[in-house]
């Protein structure tokens, strides 16, 4: 069964290389599991970028080598993605499926385009 | 066109075991994820089990974890979902699905096949 995500269309990761964005489902129903992906677009290649499950009103748990962290509050989700560098700029697409109780939801939303700018080399002072 | 055929359905006691195999046809492709969901009949589509090619990542559902085992063999395009300690509860049509890319849901979807637990 299909569901909505909505997510902000433009974010711009910091000097730091971070992006922050909240991922926002319209649940049916009570879910009490939910799975989250993220993946990123680019030049018609569509790679995973980090995943992760949580129960309601938990924490997201990520694999412990993902760049991405977040946190949960009702049916939103917030995201931050770390160690961003412009190479990484791109569209990065939140996925979200209701995996418990039945009926299974899936939701795909329209993408992020996050810029990256790598921060210029600080100058040698004397 | 891609088409996805299950087999290894039955009846079986409570208890048994069973390996269901979902077989993809129709040109050479490397899914995105492959999965298992059931339907019982007069209840709602369960997910069942996934597994993302990408990282060889599986994901269970928690009434059939510690009992049910999905894997897949990419030479052969098949995915295998193998069902011990099986019980009445997980008597239901079992369909195999796939995704071409993480970004397409699951495309395409096998005809089902019936699992039937007796106790």
């Known amino acids: 069964k299909a569901m909505h995500v909505a997510q902000p269309a433009v974010v711009l990761a910091s000097s730091r290389g971070i992006a922050s964005f909240v991922c926002e489902y319209a649940s049916p129903g009570k879910a009490t599991e939910v799975r989250v992906t993220v993946l990123r677009q680019a030049d018609s290649q569509v790679t995973e970028v980090c995943a992760a499950t949580y129960m309601m009103g938990n924490e997201l748990t990520f694999l412990d080598d993902s760049i991405c962290t977040g946190t949960s509050s009702g049916n939103q989700v917030n995201l931050t993605i770390q160690g961003l560098r412009a190479m990484d700029t791109g569209l990065y697409i939140c996925k979200v499926e209701l995996m418990y109780p039945p009926p299974y939801y899936l939701g795909i939303g329209n993408g992020t385009q996050i810029y990256v700018i790598d921060p210029e080399p600080c100058p040698d002072s004397d | 066109e891609v088409q996805l055929v299950e087999s290894g359905g039955g009846v079986v006691q409570a208890g048994g075991s069973l390996r269901l195999s979902c077989a993809a046809s129709g040109g050479t492709f490397s899914f995105y994820g492959m999965g298992w969901f059931r339907q019982a009949p007069g209840k709602e589509q369960e997910f069942v089990a996934d597994i993302r090619t990408s990282a060889g990542r599986t994901y269970y559902a928690d009434s059939v974890k510690g009992r049910f085992t999905i894997s897949r063999d990419n030479a052969k395009n098949t995915v295998y979902l193998q069902m011990n300690s099986l019980k009445p509860e997980d008597t239901a049509v079992y369909y195999c699905?796939?995704?071409?890319?993480?970004?397409?849901?699951?495309?395409?979807w096998g005809q089902g096949t019936q699992v039937k637990v007796s106790s």
């Open positions: 699905a796939a995704e071409m890319s993480g970004i397409s849901g699951w495309d395409y």
